[in-house]
Interface confidence: medium
């Protein structure tokens, strides 16, 4: 989002021969921030603290285990995606505090706000990879015994990252800084040069590939997994169901406002009241999506506590327990406890 529109008061300069309205305060930087922006700042601050510390801890725990444990490889990659995105938060925070003024230059404008989209695509693709792994463990245990290894897992992660980078390119390319006079500031946003078709195409691709298609496939995937799990009377199936639902749902819940407002804005005229309202909510939607970057460690800890009864262990050892248990393929096609539990933890970051 963050699309430039050339008729809104926020982006008013002279495209429509605007001049300064002397009845309104000039120096908007002295005005109070809008409520959605204040909420966004609060969310950004919390996400940054929890996301950086939590994901750093997850990286630390899983990095040592990644050589021998496939689950550790999945969680390591998810944590890296989240951690990377969190690094952009201080800059985004500063920009909102300055009423969206962007003093950081064109390169930073292209890269930093694109990190959340890279995170979205990397996370959903990694989640899809993890889900495929879970699916194969349940339905193709013999194949897993023969072929499921760390090398293949790393290749799958590399493919996911590569695709995520490709899918982020449009946002990266269309992101520019633009100078404004009223009020004086430099803005960072997406500029489609009045090409509504192109803007819609990008929004639709993002909605379909980053949300609707994963929602459909993961829902089907986990429906099959859970049905098989229940039919085999696997242990802790209720808890597993709850955690899996929490895991997958968190991605879709936190990305929903961003995706909905993004697709609506691409179809609305920039001068329409609905567009102007959505524009004001833009930062809040981005910050809400950013919650994905800190939710994983929280889910891991909550899940770990659930499986341990209560928090008796240190945080690292609790996380190690949750993230690095290897799935064992048994002759019977029923899930092992470790398989169910680890899947149950968090197979997403998106």
């Amino acid at each position: 989002m963050d699309s430039f529109n050339y008729t809104t008061p926020d982006y008013g300069h002279y495209d429509d021969k605007d001049t300064l309205d002397l009845n309104t305060p000039v120096d908007k930087t002295s005005n109070t921030l809008r409520v959605p922006d204040i909420l966004a700042l609060v969310i950004f601050a919390v996400v940054f603290l929890v996301g950086v510390l939590g994901n750093a801890l997850v990286v630390w725990v899983t990095a040592f285990e990644a050589k021998r444990t496939i689950n550790a490889i999945w969680f390591l990659n998810l944590a890296v995606a989240d951690f990377l995105s969190c690094l952009a938060l201080p800059i985004l925070f500063t920009s909102i505090v300055q009423h969206h003024h962007w003093p950081f230059g064109g390169a930073a404008c292209s890269i930093l706000p694109s990190l959340i989209l890279l995170n979205m695509y990397a996370s959903i693709l990694l989640l899809a990879t993890i889900s495929a792994d879970r699916f194969l463990l349940v339905f193709k245990p013999i194949w897993c015994q023969n072929f499921r290894g760390a090398g293949l897992a790393w290749i799958a992660c590399a493919v996911a990252w590569g695709l995520a980078l490709l899918l982020t390119i449009p946002s990266f390319l269309y992101r520019v800084v633009r100078e404004e006079y009223f009020p004086p500031k430099v803005l960072c946003g997406v500029d489609y040069s009045h090409d509504k078709r192109r803007e819609r195409a990008v929004a639709i691709v993002r909605l379909v590939l980053g949300f609707l298609w994963p929602l459909l496939t993961l829902t089907i995937c986990y429906t099959f997994i859970l049905l098989r799990t229940w039919s085999r009377r696997a242990t802790r199936s209720t808890k597993t169901l709850k955690v899996v639902v929490a895991v997958v749902a968190s991605f879709f819940i936190f990305w929903l406002p961003y995706q909905v407002t993004g697709i609506m804005m691409s179809f609305l005229e920039p001068s329409s009241p609905t567009f102007l309202l959505l524009k004001k909510l833009d930062s809040l939607c981005v910050s809400f999506a950013y919650i994905n970057c800190c939710i994983n460690p929280i889910i891991y800890v909550v899940a770990g506590q659930g499986f341990q009864g209560r928090l008796r262990k240190s945080l690292p050892s609790l996380l190690r327990n949750v993230l690095t248990e290897e799935s064992v393929v048994r002759e019977s096609k029923s899930f092992t406890r470790s398989t169910v539990d680890t899947m149950a933890q968090k197979t997403q970051a998106v």
Epitope: Y14, L20, L22, V26, H101, G106, E179, Y181, P184, K185
Partner: antibody
Framework: QVQLQQPGAEFVKPGASVKMSCKAS????????ITWLKQRPGQGLEWIGD????????DYNEKLKSRATLTVDTSSTTAYMQLSSLTSEDSAVYYC??????????WGQGTTVTVSS | DIQMTQSPSSLSASLGERVSLTCRAS??????LSWLQQKPDGTIKRLIY???TLESVVPKRFSGSWSGSEYSLTISSLESEDFADYYC?????????FGGGTKLEIK
């Protein structure tokens, strides 16, 4: 570093037109407004107009609007100002500037236009 | 058009002296005012924008202030390179308009 380069001088006959250039380098040309100013010998500064290269959006001083045309060539990162129907009143130094609503502004050295038969 | 009345039109001062130039706007322009310096060789430099904000490369001896419709540029301690022409410029509405200029000369 950011630079705006203007040719030193242009000599034209009355009634003719002149197209002066302002070559920008060292920054994202399409992101910043280019402003044009005029200064007649021994006199003060006068604003001619400005252009946003990312869009070609222009604003003019009504005094010169009918005779001044601001354009850009984004491929060569150059802004142009064309003045038509020149008279001796148009003999002046013309400056281009990346005004910069925040942070630094950058200025060309000016092009001296002499209108003489 | 907004008229900008700049005073004085010329000023003689000594090195190390403190000087102030003023500009009055005929209409409200809030903080949309800049101060420009033009050296004898014609080169122009913006010193102040948004009435009070100093450009990053400009020495701290320059400062801008405003009260109502009156705007001031103050040089706390004159140095030899400060002797030049100074213009105020409003950019609150079209067309942008300049003050008549102040010629600052060595006494």
């Amino acid at each position: 570093q950011v630079q705006l380069q203007q040719p030193g001088a242009e000599f034209v006959k009355p009634g003719a037109s002149v197209k002066m250039s302002c070559k920008a380098s060292g920054y994202s040309f399409t992101s910043y407004w280019i402003t044009w100013l005029k200064q007649r010998p021994g006199q003060g500064l006068e604003w001619i107009g400005d252009i946003y290269p990312g869009r070609g959006t222009t604003d003019y001083n009504e005094k010169l609007k009918s005779r001044a045309t601001l354009t850009v060539d984004t491929s060569s990162t150059t802004a142009y100002m064309q003045l038509s129907s020149l008279t001796s009143e148009d003999s002046a130094v013309y400056y281009c500037a990346r005004w910069g609503t925040t942070g630094r502004s950058y200025w060309g050295q000016g092009t001296t236009v002499t209108v003489s038969s | 058009d907004i008229q900008m009345t700049q005073s004085p039109s010329s000023l003689s001062a000594s090195l190390g002296e403190r000087v102030s130039l003023t500009c009055r706007a005929s209409q409200e322009i809030k903080t949309y005012l800049s101060w420009l310096q033009q050296k004898p060789d014609g080169t122009i430099k913006r010193l102040i924008y948004a009435a009070t904000t100093l450009e990053s490369v400009v020495p701290k001896r320059f400062s801008g202030s405003w009260s109502g419709s009156e705007y001031s540029l103050t040089i706390s301690s004159l140095e030899s390179e400060d002797f030049a022409d100074y213009y105020c410029l409003q950019y609150a509405s079209y067309p942008w308009t300049f003050g008549g200029g102040t010629k600052l000369e060595i006494k």
